[in-house]
C-alpha cells in the first residue's frame, strides 16, 4: 500500500454548492495509485462520525464535491490506494461555504443525481480520534 498520504491537498469553492478538491500523489518511491478515497463532511457531521465517502478512480488527482450546504464548514481528508491496499489519510483541510446573500439557492431544483446528500457512519479503517482530529 502507499506509504504516505496524498500531499498538497487544496479545496476551492467553484460554485455555490460545488467545490474542487485537488492533490498530488503520495511522496516516496514510485507507486501506482489506482484509487483515491475522499472523506468529507460538515464539521458537525464529522465530529458525530458521519461523513461521505467518494472514490476517485484513475490517475486524475482532482474531484468535485457536490451538494454542499451554505453556512457549513467542511472537512476533507484523502487517502491513496493500490492493488496492495490503502495508505494513510492526509491531514484534514477545511472549506467554509458561506451563506448566499440572496435566497437564489433555495429556488433551484433538487439535483437528481448521486449527490443526493446521504451520509454514512463508520470508522472506515480509522479510529474515532483520527477521524475527528482536526489538523
Amino acid at each position: 500500500a502507499p506509504a504516505g498520504p496524498p500531499v498538497g491537498v487544496k479545496v476551492t469553492l467553484i460554485e455555490d454548492d460545488t467545490a474542487l478538491v485537488s492533490w498530488k500523489p503520495p511522496d516516496g518511491p514510485e507507486t501506482v495509485v489506482t484509487r483515491y478515497t475522499i472523506l468529507y463532511a460538515s464539521r458537525k457531521a464529522w465530529i458525530a462520525g458521519e461523513w461521505q465517502v467518494l472514490h476517485r478512480e484513475g490517475a486524475i488527482t482532482m474531484a468535485l464535491l457536490e451538494n454542499l450546504v451554505a453556512g457549513n464548514v467542511y472537512i476533507v481528508k484523502i487517502s491513496a490506494s493500490n492493488e496492495v491496499g490503502e495508505g494513510p489519510f492526509s491531514n484534514s483541510v477545511e472549506l467554509a461555504v458561506l451563506p448566499k446573500e440572496t435566497s437564489e439557492s433555495n429556488q433551484r431544483p433538487k439535483r437528481l443525481d448521486s449527490a443526493d446528500a446521504k451520509v454514512y457512519s463508520g470508522y472506515y479503517h480509522l479510529d474515532q480520534k483520527s477521524m475527528t482530529g482536526i489538523a
Epitope: 467518494l54 478512480e57 457536490e66 431544483p109 439535483r111 437528481l112 443525481d113 448521486s114 449527490a115 454514512y120
Partner: nanobody, 119 residues
Framework: EVQLVESGGGLVQPGGSLRLSCKGS????????MHWVRQAPGKALEWIGY???????KYNPSLKSLVTISRDNSKNTLYLQMNSLRAEDTATYYC?????????????WGQGTLVTVSS
C-alpha cells in the same frame, strides 16, 4: 467498468464554434448529472457547468453566454457547444460523472480532449 470518452477537440480559429461530445458507458447514464470542466495550460481547473439527468442546466456565470450543455440519454452522450471562442478558451476539456452504488460514490473523469484556439 465506467468509462467517459470525450471527442471533438482540435484546432479552431478565434470567433469560431466547436461541439464536444462525451460518451458514457458502464453505468446508467440517464440517472446522473454530468459536469464539464476545463484546464488551460498551467492554470487551475475551471468548472463550466452541469446538466441534470432531467436536462436542466446550471452554468459558471462567467461562461454562461458562451457555452451550452446538452445531453442525449438515448445515446449515453453529453455535449458541450462553445461559441465565439477566444485564445483563452484553449484548454483540455473533461466530462465528469459521480455514480453511486447506494453506499459509496465513485467519481469518474474522461481522459480529456484538447481544444486549441489559434489563428
Amino acid at each position: 467498468e465506467v468509462q467517459l470518452v470525450e471527442s471533438g477537440g482540435g484546432l479552431v480559429q478565434p470567433g469560431g464554434s466547436l461541439r464536444l461530445s462525451c460518451k458514457g458507458s458502464g453505468f446508467n447514464f440517464g440517472d446522473y448529472a454530468m459536469h464539464w470542466v476545463r484546464q488551460a495550460p498551467g492554470k487551475a481547473l475551471e468548472w463550466i457547468g452541469y446538466i441534470y439527468n432531467t436536462g436542466s442546466t446550471k452554468y459558471n456565470p462567467s461562461l454562461k453566454s458562451l457555452v451550452t450543455i446538452s445531453r442525449d440519454n438515448s445515446k449515453n452522450t453529453l455535449y458541450l457547444q462553445m461559441n465565439s471562442l477566444r485564445a483563452e478558451d484553449t484548454a483540455t476539456y473533461y466530462c465528469v460523472s459521480t455514480v453511486t452504488n447506494g453506499v459509496e460514490y465513485f467519481q469518474h473523469w474522461g481522459q480529456g480532449t484538447l481544444v486549441t484556439v489559434s489563428s
